[in-house]
Interface confidence: medium
């Protein structure tokens, strides 16, 4: 309506004796600025005077003078918008209606505001959510319809009279819409908070109590349970009885069902608050709890660990690791179900007690072949001694041991024989799968671990074998000791160092490179004739007749070997010279006569010299002297001399007779 002044402010304000009131207020006058303002207490309109009667709490005039008693009330507004008021302190009798009489140049208005002042501070109001569940965060709100700048207050939360640790957030509102102080507390209630009293306490600035509001918490929660067990330590022996009782310490709402669980699994047909276990077995060991449900959900008790004690069960042995390699380390673990755990162990190796080993584990730092075998153990606890289980087998693997190469042949072995060797060993794990031989040869292996050497060579000295599984072990080499006839027999001239001259002392040696056996005999032969049985053949003074083809033989018990024929050459000066005449020693003049100087020489004659009956050398140097035509005066005695590198030789005289021809005789 355009004929009204427009005001905005809280409809009612609340306070208490001695506090203050702050009245937020805005207005809009119909025209012009505010010229006069009067604050009435419970104003009443007097129709006679056309004015309002009532207690004037505040009055502002054109000259701006305010009576001294009006200092309690302050107009904090202005001439056109703000009409905020403050009353400090406020009294009980201020309750009622406040009238704001506003006048402008041409218009007047009375605006009414309710003021409710109580004798004592009124309580705040706690607001709760419709339902509270355990562990779910909720916000508790404490609201007080009061706020005043001149009168500070605080709101504190208490749980069962004890300040709550959670931080609350306090907010105030002093607006034309609302005036309040509010505290909000975020809080995660537990089941134990159910039924507890929460208080919101109003305090002044010094923490002095002014008023409070309380509520009882209704915290919905699953049933809270306590489990009791007889015996109390839940440790029993097989055959004993056990009783477990489930007690509900709290449930909101009321519980509906009961059940029992073992190791998380529900036990059938157990729906009462008591669980009776009669003549328990070790299988009944485990974690027990009871479960009770209500509309919120199931609640579980703490677990009771029922230990049914029993003597150790038959033990088993675990080996880390089998098979084991000789020299490695191995650990044995004795495993036996028992309650309480075994305190003592007895270990057995191949049925024999291993003294001094009483622990759950046995450690062998360096495994040897004799550690192989069956390991078993017995566990012992306070209730008794278990039985020895089947045990575990330790397999210790190692290279073949004590490998030897064995000659199968009767001894001695002769060159050309067929030799059979075998490779033997003492023990091996795993089994031997192959064999190796040194040196390598094109030899036959007729069966595993056997070597056949056909036509064995004289120089086959040693053979070694290896027996192999995952590893190879070599035997020491074995000497074949092959026997053979002497080898590389040859004739060697010992002296003289240079060529042999007739008359020299000569020694020939019969050499051979090797013989097995070493005991030998020698034989010298020339042209099939035995000359001697020593290793040397000696000539004190060699003659040309000794020249020729020589052989030596060396024999041992295996056989004999001949050298190649060796030619003995004797060097000598020309000898046995003679002059032969052709066609004869009587030749007719005019014919041809040939004289030949025949000789025996080594090396052959290299130079001939011819002499006549006067020992005159003739100018001819070849072996043959040719006279053609021959003359009677050629008749006479001739001799020749032969020369080689060794020396000279001369022939005896040979007479040539030249006779006259018939013609010559005829002419005479």
């Amino acid at each position: 309506d355009s004929s009204k002044w427009v005001f905005e402010h809280p409809e009612t304000l609340y306070a208490w004796e001695g506090a203050c009131v702050w009245i937020p207020c805005t207005y809009r006058a119909l025209d012009g600025d505010l010229e006069s303002f009067i604050l009435f207490h419970n104003p009443e309109y007097n129709k006679n005077t056309s004015k309002f009667d009532g207690t004037r709490l505040y009055e502002s005039t054109k000259d701006g003078k305010v009576p001294s008693e009006q200092k309690r009330v302050q107009f904090l507004g202005d001439k056109n918008k703000n009409c905020t008021l403050s009353i400090h302190p406020v009294h009980l009798n201020d309750s009622g209606q406040l009238g704001l009489r506003m006048e402008s140049k041409t218009e007047k208005w009375m605006e009414r505001i309710h003021l409710n002042v109580s004798e004592r501070p009124f309580p705040p109001h706690i607001q709760l959510p419709p339902e509270i569940q355990e562990s779910q965060e909720v916000t508790l709100t404490c609201l007080l319809n009061f706020s005043c700048y001149g009168y500070p207050i605080q709101l504190q939360w208490l749980l069962e009279g004890v300040p709550m640790r959670q931080a609350a957030v306090t907010s105030t509102s002093l607006t034309i819409k609302s005036v309040f102080t509010r505290s909000e507390l975020k809080f995660s209630p537990q089941w134990s908070h159910h039924g507890k009293i929460v208080t919101c306490q109003l305090q002044d600035a010094d923490g002095k109590f002014l008023s409070n509001d309380t509520v009882q918490l209704n915290v919905k929660h699953t049933p809270k349970l306590e489990i009791k067990v007889t015996p109390s330590d839940a440790i029993v022996r097989e055959g004993d009885s056990v009783t477990m009782t489930c007690e509900v310490s709290s449930s909101n709402p009321e519980y509906t069902t009961v059940s029992w669980l073992k190791d998380g699994t529900s036990l059938k047909k157990q729906n009462t608050f008591t669980l009776n276990l009669r003549e328990v077995t070790k299988d009944q060991s485990g974690k027990y709890c009871c479960q009770v449900s209500n509309d919120v959900g199931p609640g579980r008790s703490e677990e009771v660990f029922l230990q049914v004690q029993y003597a150790p069960e038959p033990s088993t042995v675990q080996i880390l690791h089998s098979p084991a390699v000789e020299g490695s380390q191995v650990e044995f673990l004795c495993m036996s179900l028992a309650n309480p755990l075994p305190t003592n162990y007895t270990w057995y190796h191949n049925g024999k007690e291993m003294q001094g080993r009483t622990e759950e584990k046995v450690h062998i730092p360096k495994i040897l072949p004799w550690h192989a075998g069956t390991y078993s153990c017995v566990a012992e606890n306070i209730l008794g001694t278990g039985q020895r289980g089947p045990g575990a087998e330790l397999d210790v693997q190692y290279p073949p041991k004590k490998v030897t190469t064995v000659i199968q042949n009767p001894m001695p072995i002769r060159e050309g024989d067929t030799v059979t060797l075998s490779c033997n060993y003492n023990s091996s794990n795993p089994s031997v799968t192959r064999y190796e031989w040194k040196p390598h040869g094109a030899w036959e292996e007729p069966s595993l671990g056997v070597l056949k050497i056909q036509n064995v060579g004289w120089d086959n000295t040693t053979i070694a074998c290896a027996a192999c599984n995952s590893w190879c072990s070599w035997a020491s080499p074995v000497a074949l000791n092959v026997q053979y006839a002497p080898r590389d027999v040859r004739v060697r001239k010992i002296k003289p160092l240079s060529e042999i001259h007739s008359g020299n002392s000569v020694s020939l040696q019969c050499d051979f490179s090797s013989s097995h056996p070493k005991e030998v005999q020698f034989f010298w032969e020339k042209n099939g004739r035995l000359l001697g049985k020593e290793s040397q053949l000696n000539f004190d003074s060699i003659s040309p007749e000794d020249a020729g083809s020589y052989s030596c033989w060396v024999n041992n018990s295996i056989g004999q070997t001949a050298s190649k024929a060796w030619t003995l050459e004797v060097l000598y000066a020309p000898r046995r010279l003679r002059v032969s005449m052709s066609p004869g020693d009587q030749v007719m003049e005019g014919k041809s006569a040939t004289l030949t100087c025949e000789s025996d020489a080594n090396p052959p004659v290299s130079h001939y010299t011819w002499f006549d009956w006067n020992n005159q050398s003739l100018p001819y140097h070849s072996q043959k002297l040719r006279l053609e035509p021959v003359k009677v005066q050629h008749s006479g005695a001739y001799w020749c001399q032969g020369t080689n590198s060794v020396g000279k030789g001369r022939s005896p005289l040979s007479t040539l007779t030249v006779y006259y021809s018939p013609e010559t005789i005829g002419r005479r």
Epitope: W347, E353, M354, G356, V362, P365, K366, W370
Partner: antibody, heavy 122, light 110 residues
């Protein structure tokens, strides 16, 4: 209680032989590895040899290998050490000691005899 | 097999703690947890004090303790007493299936 008593010590010329004995009582002799340990006058302890509980395996220090032989007679509860080709450096107090048990190797000696003195001198 | 290395002597006052070291190689001390310690009073047989690095036989005072790091084992005696004065030997199993001793440490209680 466990007792180990050595005997057989004395003075011997280099190159000659001597046999030590160790009589055991107070425990199951056949279940334990047995050792010989020696100590030259004023010198260190030196491990000599070990024999397994059943006599199946024997191990020797390098210094005595090939000259000394360890043996046992479980029926007589007695341990022996046959010492051949004795040298001056073999002069020592010889102790017999009980091994910790079956393991033999990685052993420790929980009981010792009082020792017997062997003097090798010409 | 070389002897294990021990200091020739150590000393301490009553109530103090001392440590004796024993150094070997990876083939003995470092390779196995089979180190033992022996106490020997003059003219007496040795007595086992620690076995398998750190275990105490029954009857041996808990003032004696053993440990090992790498190739070195140690014997510690706390709250030293006059009767602890003796020679102390360490011993170890070796990779060649033999045993080896140290050359001993003379402990003097001042």
């Amino acid at each position: 209680q466990v007792q180990l008593v050595e005997s057989g010590g004395g003075v011997v010329q280099p190159g000659r032989s001597l046999r030590l004995s160790c009589a055991a009582s107070g425990f199951t002799f056949s279940a334990y590895g047995m050792h010989w340990v020696r100590q030259a006058p004023g010198k260190c302890l030196e491990w000599v040899a070990v024999i397994l509980y059943d006599g199946s395996n024997k191990y020797y220090a390098d210094s005595v290998k090939g000259r000394f032989t360890i043996s046992r007679d479980n029926s007589k509860n007695t341990l022996y050490l046959q010492m051949n080709s004795l040298r001056a450096e073999d002069t020592a107090v010889y102790y017999c000691a009980r091994g910790s048990g079956w393991l033999q190797l990685g052993d420790y000696f929980d009981y010792w005899g009082q020792g017997t003195l062997v003097t090798v001198s010409s | 097999q070389s002897a294990l290395t021990q200091p020739p002597s150590v000393s301490g006052s009553p109530g103090q703690s001392i440590t004796i070291s024993c150094t070997g190689t990876s083939s003995d001390v470092g390779g196995y947890n089979y180190v033992s310690w022996y106490q020997q009073h003059p003219g007496k047989a040795p007595k086992l004090m620690i076995y398998e690095v750190s275990n105490r036989p029954s009857g041996v005072s808990n003032r004696f303790s053993g440990s090992k790091s790498g190739n070195t084992a140690s014997l510690t005696i706390s709250g030293l007493q006059a009767e602890d004065e003796a020679d102390y030997y360490c011993s170890s199993y070796t990779s060649s299936s033999t045993l080896v001793f140290g050359c001993g440490t003379k402990l003097t209680v001042l």
